[in-house]
Interface confidence: low
């Protein structure tokens, strides 16, 4: 903002707007009776250059003409693009104390002439929209540049609009505010953009288009779907469109999908039948429109319609497993387990399961419905039993899945051989085996079953299992496998009416146990000592314990202790040792060993045997 100059004037030659690389002469003149009051001859005019309001140069040495005390002319060169402020000041050199006094100032703009606008593109959104064009302005001019958009067409149609670019705003789009109607579909229109600033002007090449070239239909609206007879797989998609639309594109996908199903529909008139939908699935539907079969542009996609298809009756086979436990001499408890159907099989919300237990010969049948994925019943130990389970939703039930109830580990000849369990990584275990050696009936399938070896796991937690075809001899188990936990793994071989099994323990990752077993008692029986202990608490085992070690040494001895290594069995909590001298006091302790190493020692107990030495 240049204020009124009271002391004098500043002028620029050739002009205050110059092309990049040009020089300019700036003249600073004092008004009559202005200047240093006592000594006019001591008037010194200086010119200061400011860029972004920062003083960058005193142009004292650039004087090309000096009319002592009245005016000075300075030549300025190498001006950078944009605006530069020059302020002329009066320096009364006889007074060293007074700072120079501002006289007047001028702003010089350095820029370039505009390039011809290029890449003109025009659109009209919808049949009732208005024509708007955009273009590429080319290099920045650093000057206020006016742009004029001119359109001409049939019947002497002409129309123009203007805008400008400067350092605060950019002009590369204009809306002409006119509407082209479908009755002009075959007509040709021409647009041109002209750019002008203080250093020159330029014009674009003419850009020609027709109605169909530029009109983009509005996206379809009011989308809805009607499912025929509440079908989960067939539906009619309906929508509203502009009147001239002849072609639609439909896309739809389940919400968790990454790829769209695409359909082209000609002359659909706002309606299309879909026949390949998945029941009980959240879908997203979108539609786009075009005004001409071969030319023109597609509209934007419509807003999404999100809806869930109706249910249909479940399909697929339930994966069933069971456990048998004898209660007494004539009763057994059967616990049935099954896995939930996946969504594409359930085809709706499963409301309940129909469970049937049937004794084959006596035709005794127990039936029940449950909302859980397990069911337990007490039945006689006699007879041949079969179980079946089906899943039901609001539209119906799946076909029942049958399984024969056999003695799962009853036939030694069916027991798989050389079962091994190796940790593959933090969350899975590779189980391998060899087929039974002398099976008298063919193996129909293998079942690999596992559960955590923790107190109460049999009653608290259902088993996990995998069904393996009869020609496979390995399984990678990962469901619910956690590191530092020991699992009991059983491999069952099942024939039509018999079962055999082998068992092993395994873990996916292990560490040495946190502590050793706690010795609870030492008793002497028939010249042998029985050591009793409590097992290490489950969280402190940190994997499968392979064996326990019992250490002992004479109380005050510095010699290495003796030790006895016992294979780990969950059911065992005492062990005899017989190599201790009578009437000698010993110190005893225990440790536990996993594949990762040995635990710290458990508690120490002292004991002095009384009997004869062996």
């Amino acid at each position: 903002n240049i204020d009124v100059c009271k002391l004098g004037t500043v002028t620029v030659q050739p002009a205050p707007v110059i092309p990049l690389g040009s020089a300019a002469n700036i003249s600073c003149s004092l008004n009559p009776k202005q200047g240093c009051s006592h000594y006019p001859s001591s008037n010194e005019l200086i010119l200061l250059k400011f860029v972004n309001d920062v003083l960058v140069e005193n142009l004292h040495g650039k004087k090309v003409h000096d009319h002592t005390g009245h005016s000075s002319t300075f030549q300025v060169t190498n001006l950078s693009l944009g605006m530069t402020l020059f302020v002329c000041k009066l320096n009364c050199s006889n007074s060293q104390k007074k700072p120079p006094v501002p006289v007047c100032g001028v702003e010089i703009s350095v820029g370039v002439a505009p390039e011809p606008p290029q890449n003109i593109s025009c659109v009209q959104e919808g049949e009732n929209g208005t024509v708007a064009c955009s273009w590429n302005s080319g290099k920045v001019t650093y000057l206020k540049t006016n742009y004029t958009l001119q359109l001409s067409g049939p019947n002497n149609l002409t129309c123009q609009k203007q805008c400008f670019s400067d350092n605060r705003q950019n002009c590369n789009r204009l809306d002409l505010g006119i509407n082209l109607s479908p009755d002009l579909a075959e007509s040709r229109f021409i647009v041109r953009v002209t750019a002008i600033n203080d250093l020159g002007n330029s014009s674009s090449l003419p850009h020609t288009f027709t109605f169909l070239d530029i009109v983009i239909p509005l996206p379809p609206w009011d989308i809805r779907i009607n499912f025929l007879n509440a079908s989960g797989s067939r539906g009619t998609l309906q929508w509203e469109d502009e009147g001239q639309v002849v072609l639609n594109q439909l896309r739809y996908q389940p919400l968790n999908s990454t790829s769209w199903n695409m359909v082209n529909a000609t002359n659909a008139k706002g309606k299309y039948d879909l026949r390949d939908l998945r029941p009980f699935t959240e879908y997203e539907f979108q539609i786009s429109s075009k005004l001409h079969l071969s030319g023109g542009s597609w509209s934007n996609w419509s807003e999404s319609l999100r809806t869930r298809t109706p249910e249909e009756e479940p399909v697929g086979i339930l994966d069933i497993w069971y456990m048998k436990q004898d209660i007494d001499y004539d009763r057994q408890q059967i616990s049935l387990f099954w896995k939930s159907l996946n969504p594409s099989e359930a085809r709706g919300k499963i409301l309940h399961y129909q469970v049937t237990l049937q004794e084959v010969t006596k035709k005794t049948t127990l039936q029940n419905t449950t909302r859980h994925t397990s069911w337990t019943r007490v039945i006689p130990r006699t007879g041949a039993w079969t179980a079946s389970v089906s899943a039901a939703n609001s539209k119906g039930a799946s076909a029942p899945t049958h399984i024969n109830i056999v003695d799962l580990c009853g036939t030694g000849l069916l027991a798989p051989h050389q079962v091994s369990a190796k940790s593959e990584n933090m969350d899975n275990i590779l189980v391998t085996w060899q087929p039974p050696k002398k099976a008298d009936s063919a193996v129909r399938e293998y079942i690999v079953e596992w559960r955590a070896l923790q107190p109460g796991s049999i009653t608290k937690f259902p088993p996990h299992w995998l069904r393996i075809p009869p020609d496979n001899m390995s399984a990678l188990i990962s469901e619910n496998i956690k590191p530092y936990i020991c699992y009991e793994i059983r491999v069952h071989a099942l024939s039509e009416s018999q079962g055999g099994c082998s068992s092993i323990r395994g873990d996916s990752k292990h560490k040495a146990p946190v502590s050793g077993p706690h010795i609870t008692a030492i008793t002497e029986k028939k010249e042998r000592l029985f050591i009793s202990w409590t097992h290490i608490p489950f969280p402190e085992q940190r994997g499968c314990i392979l064996h326990y070690r019992i250490y002992w040494k004479e109380r005050d001895s510095t010699a290495q202790p003796e030790l006895c290594e016992i294979q780990y069995r969950r059911s065992q909590n005492s062990h005899p040792i017989s190599s201790l001298q009578p009437r000698v006091t010993y110190v005893l302790w225990m440790t536990a060993v996993t594949a990762a190493g040995e635990s710290p020692q458990g508690n120490e107990r002292e004991f002095c045997p009384q009997g004869k030495a062996n």
């Epitope: 400011f50 309001d53 003083l55 007074k98 006094v101 501002p102």
Partner: nanobody
Amino acid sequence: QVQLQESGGGLVQAGGSLRLSCAASGRTFSWYRMGWFRQAPGKEREFVAGWYGVLTQYRDSVKGRFTISRDDAKNTVYLQMNSLKPEDTAVYYCAASLGGNYRSYEYDYWGQGTQVTVSS
């Protein structure tokens, strides 16, 4: 040597106006570039508006709302503040310099400041 004293601050509703004055002592007031700065709690002092002979300048966020003017006969510089916003709340300082622009360390003389509070 110049002494500066601001006045005119106060509490005002958003959208309201205030006029700050800065009175200077000394006979050479007309030689000095005058500036207004402000400092909100916990923030650095920032340039608001300045007058340098033929040139006035403003920070972008106050352009069109604030106007700086001066009366050399009264040795006073003014800041007219219209359409005030809550973010304009700060202590406003008047400053004088023989050659500075908009950096606060270039100013030689400062007033004590006046509090402006804009409530929403």
